[in-house]
């Protein structure tokens, strides 16, 4: 069957796999006049890798809480048994009711864009629900994800998130929108309002048009022991133990303390949704307790003192002292001042000496004063804040915060690449490729100090020499290395990096990138001498930029062969001279040759070789460049991409035969790189360039 080049380049010729994984097809090429011998196009088929998603793909979250994604929720696998690190999820559409973030990264940062299955297994991918202003009973969120692991085809996944007050939540013991308890002065009355007790989230389970005729019925199952509940001034008692959410909302529920002490009080209740006129509806219900704290009317509330942030290194433990948490309260003992953790950061937890290994959520000032309270930095090295509430048991709780700054245990200066300075410019900006500090995360606030300066140049910021600079200045491209001495092709300097109290040193290497166009083309024939000219090495642009004639010095190579100066004409006396130095002018004059040798001690065949050159020009630093080339046994039928000044001896003896194309000792025609009429890079051009022989 015949296929044309245009069909190939138009993508109209398809290969359909069937049978074994290794195989291919034979073909010949013809331009209508000439036909090439047979070729074989090898095709290797890969087994198709399939990705699959298991797990419920549903996550139940307690309102206002953080819940890790787990393997029960999201579990990807591949038919090739791919490492979970290589199973990548991309967040196509993030959550609407909260956010997704990584436990080991700053929880205040940007939304998570991608994560791996391994991170899911580790429990590091967290969904945080953000409480809306309006009450709700159940809310639904979705995350649209795309699972990918090349070469497998991507798989779309939807993770459904159910945020429900129905769920049993250790972080939130109440199923109601609010159940905060009440503070009442001894012997006095206080209104219980929806700021303290609010079941409007139960009502939210009813569609809004019908909501006005529904209500929540509270039945008191255990009455206060030190006071009385009243609804619209009517006392509640065992015979009349009910009140409604609507009465609460109207401010009709009151607790009256009976006096005689400041012991705790409270009541237990059941609450359920009821329909119009109390009819039954299939709505939510809950049984809970409402706490009432009676305080001494003469008491002065505690005064929180200014707090110093706690600083400690990642992976360590540090005691919390009065510098972090203290109050002034003349009429309370330290043991009576209680702290409760309302919200904890993700960078560690509080623990009590002798209180078990796990985190504590309640402690006293006495625990702080005695040094029993400590912070364990088991998370990432980020700053975090504990939101606490503090109370002396007699005054309403006061909000307090404790800032914890986790310092990295060690930092590393990452040097991804040496600094390359363009030869004609003599200067270049540093970037994250040269200097970047990481601990367990990136350190964008890092600062650098020069502890050993460069020998042949300066570091500049804003055009002025500097010995100190920041990561921010690097990222903005403001830190520049400039050569001041044009005698070396490389330099180096040493910096000390400082990030959040930890330092590390590193050496930045500087190299000059030669302004030289190098083109070796296809393989060069062993045993031949080819012309070195601007089609192979060209420093013409450097010549223009420096208004000088660039000079080349041969530093190394070739391993098999040598660079020679060739006579201008046959009449010129002497053979080829070995060259160690030459100029751009020599190249342009065509006076240089490269004798391509044969590798000794091995069978004839393809080989590789190179030249290492130092390029000099006026007023710019020198640069080292290399010319890498491939060699092969001479093939008279092959159109080489460079001019051949001579061909191997063996080929010359064949000169009388019709196939010989290069007269002895004469420069061969300069063969250009084959460029067929079809678009470059097409399949046909690949075949033409590589398969005619």
């Amino acid at each position: 069957r015949t296929r044309s080049g245009s069909q190939l380049d138009g993508g109209l010729v398809l290969f359909s796999h069937r049978g074994t994984l290794d195989g291919g097809f034979r073909f010949r090429l013809s331009d209508g006049e000439h036909t090439s011998p047979g070729h074989f196009f090898r095709v290797t088929a890969q087994k198709q890798v399939l990705l699959s998603l298991k797990g419920s793909q549903t996550l139940t979250v307690c309102p206002g809480s953080v819940q890790p994604l787990s393997s029960q929720t999201l579990r990807a696998s591949s038919s090739a048994g791919t490492d979970p690190q290589l199973l990548l999820y991309r967040v196509v559409r993030g959550p609407q009711l909260g956010r997704l973030f990584h436990a080991q990264q700053d929880s205040t940062g940007e939304a998570l864009v991608n994560f791996t299955q391994a991170e899911v297994y580790a429990g590091n991918i967290l969904y945080e629900h953000e409480m809306p202003p309006e009450p709700f009973w159940e809310a639904h969120d979705t995350l649209e994800l795309q699972l990918s692991s090349p070469p497998a085809r991507d798989v779309a996944a939807t993770l459904a998130v159910a945020v429900s007050f129905e769920a049993a939540c250790p972080q939130r013991p109440s199923h109601l929108w609010k159940n905060k308890g009440l503070w009442v002065p001894e012997g006095q009355r206080a209104r219980i309002t929806v700021a303290a007790l609010d079941a409007s989230n139960l009502l939210a389970s009813v569609p809004s048009p019908q909501r006005s005729e529904h209500d929540v019925l509270f039945q008191v199952t255990q009455f206060p022991s030190r006071g009385q509940l009243l609804v619209s001034e009517e006392p509640l008692h065992a015979g009349q133990p009910h009140f409604l959410q609507s009465q609460l909302a109207a401010g009709q529920l009151v607790y009256a303390h009976g006096g005689g002490g400041t012991q705790q009080d409270g009541f237990h209740f059941r609450a359920h949704l009821q329909g119009p006129a109390g009819a039954s509806v299939a709505g939510p219900q809950t049984s809970e307790a409402f706490a009432i704290t009676v305080r001494d009317v003469n008491e002065r509330p505690p005064q929180p003192q200014a707090s110093v942030p706690l600083r400690l290194t990642r992976g360590s433990r540090a005691p919390i002292s009065r510098a972090q948490l203290s109050v002034v309260d003349p009429d309370s003992a330290p043991g009576e001042i209680e702290y409760e953790v309302q919200r904890a950061p993700h960078n560690g937890f509080l623990s009590l000496v002798g209180g078990g290994l796990g985190p504590v959520t309640r402690f006293t000032q006495a625990d702080v004063d005695s040094g029993r309270l400590a912070f364990v930095a088991n998370g990432s090295s980020v700053a975090g804040i504990f939101q606490l509430s503090m109370s002396d048991g007699a005054s309403p709780p006061l909000p307090m915060s404790l800032a914890v700054d986790i310092l990295p245990s060690a930092i590393e200066v990452q040097l991804r690449a040496p600094l390359e300075v363009p030869q004609a410019l003599g200067r270049s900006s540093l970037s994250q490729q040269q200097l970047r500090v990481v601990s367990d995360r990136e350190e964008p606030e890092a600062a650098y100090r020069l502890i050993q300066g460069p020998q042949y140049g300066h570091l500049l910021v804003g055009g002025r020499p500097t010995s100190a600079f920041s990561q921010f200045q690097i990222d903005q491209g403001e830190v520049v290395f400039a050569f001041t001495n044009s005698s070396s092709s490389h330099d180096h300097f040493r910096v000390l990096a400082l990030a959040r109290g930890v330092n590390a040193s590193a050496v930045v290497n500087v190299t000059v990138r030669a302004l030289l166009h190098v083109w070796a083309g296809g393989p060069w024939p062993q045993g031949a001498t080819l012309r070195l000219d601007p089609t192979v090495l060209d420093a013409g642009e450097l010549a223009n930029r420096t208004d000088s004639v660039p000079r080349f010095r041969l530093l190394e190579g070739p391993r098999h062969g040598r660079v020679v100066r060739v006579p201008r004409a046959r009449t010129e006396p002497g053979g080829s001279q070995l060259v160690e130095q030459f100029t751009q002018q020599d190249l342009e004059d065509g006076r240089l040759g490269l004798e391509v040798g044969r590798p000794e001690g091995r069978a004839p065949g393809p080989a590789g070789d190179s030249l290492t050159l130092e390029l000099w020009a006026q007023g710019v630093p020198p640069a080292v460049a290399s010319l890498d080339f491939a060699t092969e046994p001479y093939n008279a039928a092959r159109p080489y991409s460079v001019a051949l000044l001579s061909v191997p001896e063996a080929a010359r003896t064949e000169a009388g035969k019709p196939e010989s194309s290069t007269p002895t000792g004469e420069p061969g025609p300069m063969a250009s790189s084959p460029e067929p009429a079809v678009a470059k890079g097409g399949f046909l051009s690949f075949l033409e360039a590589n398969m005619f022989s």
Epitope: V231, E234, S246, R270, H272, A277, S280, V281, A282
Partner: antibody, heavy 117, light 113 residues
Framework: QVQLVQSGAEVKRPGASMKVSCKAS????????IHWVRQAPGQGLEWMGW????????NYAQKFQGRVTMTRDTSTSTVYMELSSLRSEDTAVYYC??????????WGQGTLVTVSS | DIVMTQSPDSLTVSLGERATINCKSS????????????LAWYQQKPGQPPKLLIY???TRESGVPDRFSGSGSGTDFTLTIDSLQPEDSATYYC?????????FGQGTRLEIK
């Protein structure tokens, strides 16, 4: 002391309308639904409907739909029940009842309405 | 509508004995969400309005003597009056307060001998 005091007995001709009142006292009027229940002589109890004194919303039994209207006057804490197109079988004692949830904890003394030609 | 059926229509029980009245609903009046049975019992004496005895099938109203008790769930309920007193002579009604229209049983007349 919760009290529901109803208007006095009435005699009506068939086809006429009647309007019975129920005045509440001793509690917050707008907090509790008022229901109307009737009892024909020697018969059982029959629920007619409810009114929410707070919103004025009503719900009537299908049997009385189109004939009954319940209204309230929050300034006097009074609820009214009007029944039109009276027939002899509407002869009954009409009770108003205050509901706590949906059971009837307090009842008015009843109003006898006789429909006779 | 939920139909309430009481049995017996009438009964006569000796003073000091126990009386049992049954009530059956045509469909369940149990709310599975809050586990409440929406059923009440009333007592009515001639010339008087009814008086609430029991709600939620088994909760006694304030001031009701503890000789009165309610039991049952779903569709079958019972009012039990222990050690009958002369003043217990009356007509007893069950009522479902599960859904509107709220409906009553036809009544059970209790006489004391």
């Amino acid at each position: 002391q919760v009290q529901l005091v109803q208007s006095g007995a009435e005699v009506k001709r068939p086809g006429a309308s009647m309007k019975v009142s129920c005045k509440a006292s001793g509690y917050t009027f707008t907090n509790y639904y008022i229901h109307w229940v009737r009892q024909a002589p020697g018969q059982g109890l029959e629920w007619m409907g409810w009114i929410n004194p707070n919103s004025g919303a009503t719900n009537y039994a299908q049997k009385f739909q189109g004939r009954v209207t319940m209204t309230r006057d929050t300034s006097t804490s009074t609820v009214y029940m009007e029944l039109s197109s009276l027939r002899s079988e509407d002869t009954a004692v009409y009770y108003c009842a205050k509901s706590w949830v949906s059971w009837f904890a307090s009842w008015g003394q009843g109003t006898l309405v006789t429909v006779s030609s | 509508d939920i139909v309430m059926t009481q049995s017996p229509d009438s009964l006569t029980v000796s003073l000091g004995e126990r009386a049992t009245i049954n009530c059956k609903s045509s469909q369940s009046v149990l709310n599975s969400k809050n586990n409440r049975n929406y059923l009440a019992w009333y007592q009515q004496k001639p010339g008087q309005p009814p008086k609430l005895l029991i709600y939620w099938a088994s909760t006694r109203e304030s001031g009701v003597p503890d000789r009165f008790s309610g039991s049952g769930s779903g569709t079958d309920f019972t009012l039990t009056i222990d050690s009958l007193q002369p003043e217990d002579s009356a007509t007893y009604y069950c009522q479902q307060h599960y859904s509107t229209p709220f409906t009553f049983g036809q009544g059970t007349r209790l006489e004391i001998k």
